[in-house]
Amino acid sequence: ISYDSPDYTDESCTFKISLRNFRSILSWELKNHSIVPTHYTLLYTIMSKPEDLKVVKNCANTTRSFCDLTDEWRSTHEAYVTVLEGFSGNTTLFSCSHNFWLAIDMSFEPPEFEIVGFTNHINVMVKFPSIVEEELQFDLSLVIEEQSEGIVKKHKPEIKGNMSGNFTYIIDKLIPNTNYCVSVYLEHSDEQAVIKSPLKCTLLPPGQESESAESAK
C-alpha cells in the first residue's frame, strides 16, 4: 500500500481532535489570516482507500469552527486525510490539510460530573451518554481524584461493561466539617498527559457528637 498523495499540509490551520462526551469532535484555529472566513467546508478521505474527498454533510458551509465526526470516522487505526476549506462569500480564502490517526491523535476530555457532600462521604455522579459506540471506548479508565488539605487520593472505579449511562461513585471514610475537592478525568493506557476537569469542592457538614465519638474509636 502506498499513500503518496501530495504532502501539502498547510501550516495556516491548527487542528485538534477530541473525545468530548464520547463524541469525536474536530476543532480548528486559523493562524495569521487577515480575512476571517464567513464559513467553512470540511472534506476527508481514508488514506488506505484512495477515493475522492468526501464532504462532511453537517460541516458543509458551516460557520462553526468545529465538526462532529462521530458518525463519519469509525476506525481508530486508519489515517483520515482531512481538508478544511475557508470561504468569504463565494471566494475560497484557503485550504489546509492534515492527517489524523484517532489512536494517536485523540485527546480525551473529562466527563461532566456533579458532587453531593454528606457528613462523611461524597457522592460523585459522572454523566456518560446513554449509548457509546464501541470504537470510541479507547480502553479508557475513569479516574476520580479527591483532594483535601494538600493530600490527593486517586480512585479508579471499576466500570462493568461500557462507559455509558450515569455512574455514581461514593468516596467514603471522609472527615466531617472538612473541605474536599474532586476532579475527574479519563486515562488511556499510555504515557499521554491527561486532561483533568476543573475541581468541584464541597464543605462536608459537621458530624453529630455520637458520630465523631464513634469515628474516634
Partner: antibody, heavy 119, light 112 residues
Framework: QVQLQQSGGELVRPGTSVKVSCKAS????????IEWIRQRPGQGLEWIGV????????KSSKNLKGKATLTADKSSNTAYMQLSSLTSDDSAVYFC????????????WGQGTTLTVSS | DVVMTQTPLTLSVTIGQPASISCKSS???????????LNWLLQRPGQSPKRLIY???KLDSGVPDRFTGSGSGTDFTLKISRVEAEDLGVYYC?????????FGGGTKLEIK
C-alpha cells in the same frame, strides 16, 4: 525509493541520555506514522511507541515508564527518540519504521541503531 | 498487555518441505472496526525485520505466495508451503489491535 536512515551506534554511560534520529526519504513524511521498536541482545522485539509526524502527537508504552520521548521535525523529514536515565537494560538495537495503518505493522524499517550503555 | 505465545521455539525443516508456526494471543484480536490486526514479520540474520503478512492473511508486495496466514480471534498460523533457503531467520507475530502493540517471542526457522 523509500528509505529510513538512522543515526550511528552510541556508547554511553549509565544515567545519561541519548537521542536517536531517523531521516525519512522517498515518500511524503506526514502521510505515515513512525514507530520505534527495540531488540535487546539475543532477544525478541519490543514496541516502544509511535508518532504522527504531522501533528507531533505520540503514544508510548507504559512499560518503558517515561524513558522514551518521541518527536518529529517536518522541515527535515526526521523523527527522533530521546532515551533518558539510561541503564545497562537499555542496551539494544533500536529500529524506526513507518506505518500507514496503525496496528498493521510497518512496511519499511530503518537499519537499526545499536545503543550500548556501559560504565 | 496482550501476551502473544508462539510455538515452536525452533523449527528445523528440509528445503522443499512445508513449515507451520502457531501464534496464540491472550485475548481476542478482533477490533471494533471488524478487522484483526495480526501481522507476521521475518528477521533474517543481521538484518532489520521485514513484514510478510498483515491483517492475518494479506501478503505484502514482493512476498512469495508460498507464505499464507490464517486464523481468527486468538489462534493464528503462518504456513510456508515449500521452504526455501532464503526463508531462514526468526519469524514474529505482532498484534496491533490492543495498546500497547506486542510481539510473540519468535520462532527460529533453521534449514536441515
Amino acid at each position: 525509493q523509500v528509505q529510513l536512515q538512522q543515526s550511528g551506534g552510541e556508547l554511553v554511560r549509565p544515567g545519561t541520555s541519548v537521542k536517536v534520529s531517523c531521516k525519512a526519504s522517498g515518500y511524503a513524511f506526514t502521510n505515515y506514522l513512525i514507530e520505534w521498536i527495540r531488540q535487546r541482545p539475543g532477544q525478541g522485539l519490543e514496541w516502544i511507541g509511535v508518532i504522527n509526524p504531522g501533528s507531533g502527537n505520540s503514544k508510548s508504552s507504559k512499560n518503558l515508564k517515561g524513558k522514551a520521548t518521541l518527536t518529529a521535525d517536518k522541515s527535515s523529514n526526521t523523527a527522533y527518540m530521546q532515551l533518558s536515565s539510561l541503564t545497562s537494560d537499555d542496551s539494544a538495537v533500536y529500529f524506526c519504521a513507518r506505518s500507514g495503518v496503525y496496528g498493521s505493522s510497518p512496511d519499511y524499517w530503518g537499519q537499526g541503531t545499536t545503543l550500548t550503555v556501559s560504565s | 498487555d496482550v501476551v502473544m505465545t508462539q510455538t515452536p521455539l525452533t523449527l528445523s525443516v528440509t528445503i522443499g518441505q512445508p513449515a507451520s508456526i502457531s501464534c496464540k494471543s491472550s485475548q481476542s484480536l478482533l477490533d471494533s472496526d471488524g478487522k484483526t490486526y495480526l501481522n507476521w514479520l521475518l528477521q533474517r540474520p543481521g538484518q532489520s525485520p521485514k513484514r510478510l503478512i498483515y491483517l492475518v492473511s494479506k501478503l505484502d508486495s514482493g512476498v512469495p505466495d508460498r507464505f499464507t496466514g490464517s486464523g481468527s480471534g486468538t489462534d493464528f498460523t503462518l504456513k510456508i508451503s515449500r521452504v526455501e533457503a532464503e526463508d531462514l531467520g526468526v519469524y514474529y507475530c505482532w498484534q496491533g489491535t490492543h495498546f500497547p502493540q506486542t510481539f510473540g517471542g519468535g520462532t527460529k526457522l533453521e534449514i536441515k
